[in-house]
Every structure is written in C-alpha cells, then in structure tokens.
C-alpha cells in the first residue's frame, strides 16, 4: 500500500537562500552542521541531478547504518526537491521505498514554509510503523534547525 504523511514547518530564512543551503548544498552542509545526525554523504552515481544515487551514513549508535537516496527531481526555480529512499534504513521486507517531496515557499515576512510529503510504499498489506514516521520527521527537523542556525550565524553563506 501507499501511506502519505504531510507536514509543514516554518523557517526564518528566505526561501531562495534556504533552498541553496538545505537542498542544493545539503550534502556538504549536513555533516558539518549536524554531525550528531549525519556522519557523511557520498555520491554513488550521478552528478547531483535526477537519477543520482547517494549514500547517507549515520553516526555510531543509530538504529540504521545508512540509507541510499535517489534524486527524482530538482526544480531550482520553484524550490522543489523530490527524492526517494531506496535502500538501507527502514527499507526491507515490509517497506519498498519512501518517496519524499519538499517544497519551500516564500512567506510575506521574508521567511519560508517547508511543505513536506512522505509517501511510504509498503509491500502487500503491511502498514507503516508510527515510530518510523516520527523518527523521519525528527531527523528532518534536526537538519533544518541546524542549517537554519548555521545560516543565522554565517550571514554571507548561501546568499
């Protein structure tokens, strides 16, 4: 089956700047600003565009060693990024893949809203574990706040 979870979160960072940092250069930034959440990101194949496969490794003590993500779409003019978790982590006997969509929307106050959709593609009749959805959401929030803090502290970065 397919189980869809949608969330929204806000940031004080303007949409264009946040997209550059969080999406377009996140693979470089995450291990630097949130080493407690992500230890490394490496491209397995591709140059960053659609079809690219990347391996995200987690620090010691995490329940999973790594996940592999596939880049599905990067729309840098509309601040949209689609990717799928295709291997490692929770992917296995009951879960086929997780398709994720992130859209960053500018707000009138100069900040932004992140609209996030996570589609869990389960095998057969299996359901999604609530703790997995919660862990995924917490990871996203951790990375976002770490990037946000970095940008607030480094006013020249990603302008």
């Amino acid at each position: 089956g397919v189980f869809n979870y949608e969330t929204e979160t806000t940031s004080v960072i303007p949409a264009a700047r946040l997209f550059k940092a969080f999406i377009l250069d996140g693979d470089n930034l995450f291990p630097k600003v949130a080493p407690q959440a992500i230890s490394s990101v490496e491209n397995i194949e591709g140059n960053g565009g659609p079809g690219t496969i990347k391996k995200i490794s987690f620090p010691e003590g995490f329940p999973f060693k790594y996940v592999k993500d596939r880049v599905d779409e990067v729309d840098h003019t509309n601040f949209k990024y689609n990717y799928s978790v295709i291997e490692g982590g929770p992917i296995g006997d009951t879960l086929e893949k997780i398709s994720n969509e992130i859209k960053i929307v500018a707000t009138p106050d100069g900040g932004s809203i992140l609209k996030i959709s996570n589609k869990y593609h389960t095998k057969g009749d299996h359901e999604v574990k609530a703790e997995q959805v919660k862990a995924s959401k917490e990871m996203g929030e951790t990375l976002l706040r770490a990037v946000e803090s970095y940008l607030l502290a480094h006013s020249d970065a990603y302008n």
Epitope: K20, I23, L24, D25, G26, D27, N28, L29, V41, N47, G48, G49, T52, V71, V74, H76, T77, S155, D156, A157, Y158, N159
Partner: antibody
Framework: EVELVVSGGGLVQPGGSLRLSCAAS????????MTWVRQAPGKGLEWVAN????????YYVDSVKGRFTISRDNAKNSLYLQMNSLRAEDMAVYYC??????????????????WGQGTTVTVSS | DIVMTQSPLSLPVIPGEPASISCRSS???????????LDWYLQKPGQSPQLLIY???NRASGVPDRFSGSGSGTDFTLKISRVEAEDVGIYYC?????????FGPGTKVDIK
C-alpha cells in the same frame, strides 16, 4: 546586500596591460561561476569570459583569447581579469557579474543576478 | 556561436500602457532539463545591467510582477503589462546555453 565592487580600470597605451579586480561582499564567491562582461562606448553588452567556481575551467570570447586571463582567489573572495596586449577595440566599461550556483547537487543557474558597478578601460596613445 | 536578434531596436512607450520586446536565437535554447537558457536584462541610463528574467520565464528576486518572460526554443518575448517611467533603458536578451554567452543588440525603451 550582496555586492560586487570592480576596480583597476584606467588609461593604458595600445599593447599595454591592466589587471581588473572584482571584490565580492555578503556572499561566498566559491559557490558561484563568475563572469566578465564589457560595454564599448555607445555599444551593447558583450560577454568576455567565464570561470568555474573552483577556477578549473575558463572560457573566453574569441577576440580576447590568448590576451586576457580570468582568475579567482576564493580565499580573498575576489575575481580578476588580467588584460595584456590591449587594443583600441578593448576600450569599454568592464563589469563583473555572478553566475550560476554550485553546490553538492551540481550547477544551477539563476541568471547573472549580481553585477559590479563597472570600471572604465581606456586604450589610447 | 549563437546569434541573438531583437525587435524592435527602439520602442517609444506610454506610461500605463503595455509593451513587448521580441528576441530570437539562431538555434534552440531549450535544454534537455526542460529550461530555456535565455535571460532578460535592463540597463537603466548610467547604471549597471540588472537581471529581470532568467531561464526564459523566471522573474528574478525583487523584479516587479509587471515584467514577464515567455517563449521557448528560438522565439522569446518580454512583456511589461503597464509601463512605468522607471522602466526606461535598454533591454537585452542573452543566451547562456553555450558557454560563449551572447547578447542581443538591445532594445531602447523611452517615454513617448
């Protein structure tokens, strides 16, 4: 506000040399391709040269190949244009401009979205 | 090299009225990523050029929504829905599909 400040223009004799500088402020140069564009008196805009974010690739308009060199010092957040064997037809206002963004996901183009104020190069004997 | 042409080369306008500038390239600017590598720039008198539209139709940050870009392949248009006095200057299209960027000759817009 992000800004590019151009300097180094002046009067030079035919066959002489000049080095233009473009200092970036409020953004990190190493994330961007950079470009030089010029405008001869009373004429339109002409692209001169591009340099990749890491300085490993350079491109030039045919008329300046072998005479001009674009370079960058990311540590100093600065872009340069070394102009040798200057000719009368090189006389123009020279602008630097910021090109596409380069990050882990590759190269993404947002137009030449930041321009310097320009510096005048006069070639005359 | 890709050759860019613009028409008209001179455009007298009336404030509050719409205006349109055409740009044509000698080969298609549509890239495999679905984007048209065509920008529009405005150079106001005595100033540096400023970006209006990038990749054919995307308005740059801070550009008023009266400016819009359209077209695909080899034919492009810049439209100003209601001209304001501050819009006078020379408008250039530029291709960035090939690394040897090329500008159009420019369209001079002034108040009639």
């Amino acid at each position: 506000e992000v800004e590019l400040v151009v300097s180094g223009g002046g009067l030079v004799q035919p066959g002489g040399s000049l080095r233009l500088s473009c200092a970036a402020s409020r953004f990190i140069l190493s994330h961007y391709w950079m470009t030089w564009v010029r405008q001869a008196p009373g004429k339109g805009l002409e692209w001169v040269a591009n340099i990749k974010q890491d300085g490993r690739e350079e491109y030039y308009v045919d008329s300046v190949k072998g005479r001009f060199t674009i370079s960058r010092d990311n540590a100093k957040n600065s872009l340069y244009l070394q102009m040798n064997s200057l000719r009368a037809e090189d006389m123009a206002v020279y602008y630097c401009a910021r090109g596409g963004f380069w990050g882990a996901m590759g190269y993404y183009y947002y137009g030449l979205d930041v321009w310097g104020q320009g510096t005048t190069v006069t070639v005359s004997s | 090299d890709i050759v860019m042409t613009q028409s008209p080369l001179s455009l007298p306008v009336i404030p509050g009225e719409p205006a349109s500038i055409s740009c044509r390239s000698s080969q298609s600017l549509l890239q495999s990523d679905g984007h048209n590598y065509l920008d529009w720039y405005l150079q106001k008198p005595g100033q540096s050029p400023q970006l209006l539209i990038y990749l054919g139709s995307n308005r740059a940050s801070g550009v008023p929504d009266r400016f819009s870009g359209s077209g695909s392949g080899t034919d492009f248009t810049l439209k100003i829905s209601r001209v304001e006095a501050e819009d006078v200057g020379i408008y250039y299209c530029m291709q960035t599909l090939q690394t040897g960027f090329t500008f159009g000759p420019g369209t001079k817009v002034d108040i009639k």
